[in-house]
Interface confidence: medium
């Protein structure tokens, strides 16, 4: 049950519990939206985002999107509700404590996305083979 103090002082829509009934509270995520990045040909990268933001809703998770085209590389860091698609993709890995990048099919660019549910977990984005074995050929290309 929710203590009387919390019931009185917090909006009801902010009281979210996990499957065990524990209070689920808003996460802290890196939240710089889209920024140019130098992250390329690395097993992992730091976001270099200086903004740590409190997500608006308790159910939101941290998301990072890495995109490379002929002109530039960008890294997007946001909070997002995993029940809703992001960039037309479902956040399949939202429960992960780490942000493990997975490639998504997007015409004209290389597009990786990850989501995770620990504080500031989208600060460190991981492309490494030890976590991502879904497309080993692609990883060979990335790390050559």
């Amino acid at each position: 049950t929710i203590p009387p103090h919390v019931q009185k002082s917090v909006n009801n829509d902010m009281i979210v519990t996990d499957n065990n009934g524990a209070v689920k509270f808003p996460q802290l995520c890196k939240f710089c939206d889209v920024r140019f990045s130098t992250c390329d040909n690395q097993k992992s990268c730091m976001s270099n985002c200086s903004i740590t933001s409190i997500c608006e809703k308790p159910q939101e998770v941290c998301v990072a999107v890495w995109r490379k085209n002929d002109e530039n590389i960008t890294l997007e860091t946001v909070c997002h509700d995993p029940k809703l698609p992001y960039h037309d993709f479902i956040l399949e890995d939202a429960a992960s404590p780490k942000c493990i990048m997975k490639e998504k099919k997007k015409p004209g660019e290389t597009f990786f996305m990850c989501s995770c549910s620990s504080d500031e977990c989208n600060d460190n984005i991981i492309f490494s083979e030890e976590y991502n074995t879904s497309n080993p050929d692609l990883l060979l290309v990335i790390f050559q």
């Epitope: 509270f25 802290l28 308790p58 504080d119």
Partner: antibody, heavy 121, light 107 residues
Framework: QLQVQESGPGLVKPSETLSLTCTVS??????????WSWIRQPPGKGLEWIGS???????YYNPSLKSRATISIDTSKNQFSLKLSSVTAADTAVYYC?????????????WGQGTLVTVSS | EIVLTQSPATLSLSPGERATLSCRAS??????LAWYQQKPGQAPRLLIY???NRATGIPARFSGSGSGTDFTLTISSLEPEDFAVYYC?????????FGQGTKVEIK
């Protein structure tokens, strides 16, 4: 009614480490409903957030303190503590320990009475 | 970090008058702004959180409004116990930061 109260030395010498303890009464410090913070206020000035300990073990600090601050929790004693290393006169302040609801992170709804710490030789 | 600027620094009013305090953020803090009251020798007391929500036990004469970068705390009719320093505080980005305070004094 859950309450917090600070304790510790009122005088610390420059370059030494300031150590304060906050005792939580009327409830468990392990509750998932609350986070625990330290905030300070130099005499006649405004408030500065030092850091917070959130349920699940994550601790956040104000980057302005340049890694000098350490917040730790002792669940067996229902206490949490602050250590601030390499203090200078600029660290002279009233130090408050405080509690906030985890569902509205970053808001303080219960404060200790505050303890004045003077840094002087 | 986000800088909060409060105005005026001092507000001189009489009991029964309306007080309007302003807080401006250096960048958007969404609706994540709180107001605290502090009397001499005491700890701050939470009045309003998330721009417009009154904390438990706070009288209805205290109200908050605003979003983004501009926020207002209004005390509809000042009571003698309302003369104090008022701080705004954002929780949108880490670290949470406070304004420098507005002193409401008896005219």
């Amino acid at each position: 009614q859950l309450q917090v109260q600070e304790s510790g030395p009122g005088l610390v010498k420059p370059s030494e480490t300031l150590s304060l303890t906050c005792t939580v009464s009327g409830g468990s410090i392990s509750s998932s409903y609350f986070s625990w913070s330290w905030i300070r206020q130099p005499p006649g000035k405004g408030l500065e957030w030092i850091g917070s300990f959130y349920y699940g073990g994550k601790t956040y600090y104000n980057p302005s303190l340049k890694s000098r601050a350490t917040i730790s929790i002792d669940t067996s004693k229902n206490q949490f503590s602050l250590k601030l290393s390499s203090v200078t006169a600029a660290d002279t302040a009233v130090y408050y320990c405080a509690r906030g609801p985890t569902t509205i992170r970053g808001v303080i709804d219960s404060w200790g009475q505050g303890t004045l710490v003077t840094v002087s030789s | 970090e986000i800088v909060l600027t409060q105005s005026p620094a001092t507000l001189s009013l009489s009991p029964g008058e309306r007080a309007t305090l302003s807080c401006r953020a250096s960048q958007s803090v969404r609706s994540y702004l709180a107001w605290y009251q502090q009397k001499p020798g005491q700890a701050p007391r939470l009045l309003i959180y998330d721009a417009s929500n009154r904390a438990t036990g706070i009288p209805a004469r205290f109200s908050g409004s605003g979003s983004g970068t501009d926020f207002t705390l209004t005390i509809s009719s000042l009571e003698p116990e309302d003369f104090a320093v008022y701080y705004c505080q954002q929780r949108s980005n880490w670290p949470p930061t406070f304004g420098q305070g507005t002193k409401v004094e008896i005219k």
